[in-house]
Amino acid sequence: LEASEEVELEPCLAPSLEQQEQELTVALGQPVRLCCGRAERGGHWYKEGSRLAPAGRVRGWRGRLEIASFLPEDAGRYLCLARGSMIVLQNLTLITGDSLTSSNDDEDPKSHRDPSNRHSYPQQAPYWTHPQRMEKKLHAVPAGNTVKFRCPAAGNPTPTIRWLKDGQAFHGENRIGGIRLRHQHWSLVMESVVPSDRGTYTCLVENAVGSIRYNYLLDVLERSPHRPILQAGLPANTTAVVGSDVELLCKVYSDAQPHIQWLKHIVINGSSFGADGFPYVQVLKTADINSSEVEVLYLRNVSAEDAGEYTCLAGNSIGLSYQSAWLTVLPEEDPTWTAAAPEARCTD
C-alpha cells in the first residue's frame, strides 16, 4: 500500500480480520493518521511493544495513531489492541519511503520542522497537534488567578500564531501586568486576571497554505468574601486498631488566608462542655494553609486514649468553619469487633 497525501484508514472503525495485517510505505515528512475502533472506544496503539502516549509528535489518542511528520525512526511495527483486552485490532508495519529530496546529513529529527532545511516536504496547512488540550473552551476563574490559553499546532511551513481579544489584535500592552506569549508552547498566559480581562480570546494559526483559529471564552468571577469552606465528609469517621497509624483529612477552600487548627475533644471533671457552653478541646496542630500538610492530622501508633472526637477548625478574616469526626480504636486482639460511631457533624 503506497501512502500518498495523508495516510488514513477509512472508515474509522475496527477493520475486519482479513484487513488486520498491513504494510504502509510513508514518505519522510508526511503526516500519518490511522484509525482503530470508534473514537469514543478506540483501541490503544503500541509501537514495538510500548504503548504510545496521548501527547507528543507520535501519539495514540482516542483510537488514532497520529504522527505529525514521519521520520526514519518512526518506521516499525504498530499494534492496536482493543481496550481492556489483548485482542489485536490492527497489526501495521510502517516503512520509510523516499523523501522528495534526500540528504546525507544526520540531522536531529526536530530540525525537519525548519523550512530552511535542505529537506523538502509537502506543504501542509496548519492543524491542531494536541486537541485534547483545547477541550476547555470556557474559562470561568476567580479574579487574581492565572489563566492560560493554548493552541498547539503544526504545519509546513511551521505556522505562526497570533492572538485576538474580541476580534482585535491582542498584545497585552494595555493590560496591567501584560501578557506572556510562549510561541514554542503556542500559549498565552495572563496572571492576576481582573474583570476587564473578560472576553473572547482567539488564537489564529497560519502559514502560507492556510489558517485555523480557535476561540476561548474568559469570564472573571469577582470574589465575594466568605469564611472557609470545608469539603463535605471530611474529616471522616475512622476505625483503627491499637498500634496502627491514622490520618484524618480536612480540605479547606478559602479566598482569604485561612488559619487551620486540629482539635481533640476532651473531658474535664466528667464534663465535655464548659460553663460557657463550649466544648473542652485540646489543640493538636495549628498552622496556615500554606504550611505543609496542615490539612492532614497524623496519629501514630494509636492507643485507646486516642479514641474520641476530632475537629478541623478553619478561620479567616470573615469567619470560622469546622467539621468533626470520630476515631474509634479497637483492641489489637479483637479486630472483628466494631463500634458504631456517631455521624460526622458539619456546622456552617
Epitope: 507528543g56 509528535r57 514554542q184
Partner: antibody, heavy 119, light 107 residues
Framework: QVQLLESGGGLVQPGGSLRLSCAAS????????MSWVRQAPGKGLEWVSV????????HYADSVKGRFTISRDNSKNTLYLQMNSLRAEDTAVYYC????????????WGQGTLVTVSS | DIQMTQSPSSLSASVGDRVTITCRAS??????LNWYQQKPGKAPKLLIY???NLQSGVPSRFSGSGSGTDFTLTISSLQPEDFAVYYC?????????FGQGTKVEIK
Amino acid sequence: QVQLLESGGGLVQPGGSLRLSCAASGFTFSDYAMSWVRQAPGKGLEWVSVIEGDGSYTHYADSVKGRFTISRDNSKNTLYLQMNSLRAEDTAVYYCAREKTYSSAFDYWGQGTLVTVSS
Amino acid sequence: DIQMTQSPSSLSASVGDRVTITCRASQDISSDLNWYQQKPGKAPKLLIYDASNLQSGVPSRFSGSGSGTDFTLTISSLQPEDFAVYYCQQHYSPSHTFGQGTKVEIK
C-alpha cells in the same frame, strides 16, 4: 545522547557576581526552551528562570528578578545565568534543565554546579 | 504565584507497598503538573509529565492522576530503588513552582 554540563560555580562574597554556563550536546539546542533550577543545601527544588529556544521569551522567579539574567548562545549550544547582587540565600546547587516540547517538563538535567555565597 | 503543597512531607514504607503522594495547587492548573524523583547527590529525574503521562524509560509501576487542583503520584509496588524524594511541579503559570517534596523512606 543528550548531555548538559554546568560550570562556573564557586565561592563568592555577598553582593558579588558569578556567571554560570551550561554546555548542551546531543540535540538541536535551538529547538528547546531551557531552565535553571536550584536547590539549597538540604532543601527542595526551586525554579529560577526559563528562556525560549530562540531567546524570544524569558521569565524569572520573584526571588531573583532584577538580579539574575538568563541568556543563550545557540551557535555555541550554551545556556548562561548571570547572577549579580548575590545573597547568602542564593547558595545552592544550580541545575540547567531542558524542557520537553509542548510541555514545561524538564526531561534532561545537568549534574549541577555549587554556588556558595559567603563572606 | 501558584503554590504547590505536597503531602505527606515524609513517609515510611516497605518494599512491595503501594505508595500514594498527593500534590495540591492553590488554583486550577488544568493538567500542567509534572512529577520528579531525586536521589541524594543526584539531579532530579522526570517520572510523569502533564499529570498522567509516563516519561519514556520510567517503570510502569509509577502512575499519575488528577487535574485542576488535586494530583496524585502512585507507586503500585515499591521497589528498593524507589526510596527517594519526590517533587511535583506546576507549569501552568510562567513561574514553574515546585512542591516542597515528599521523602519516601524504608520502614
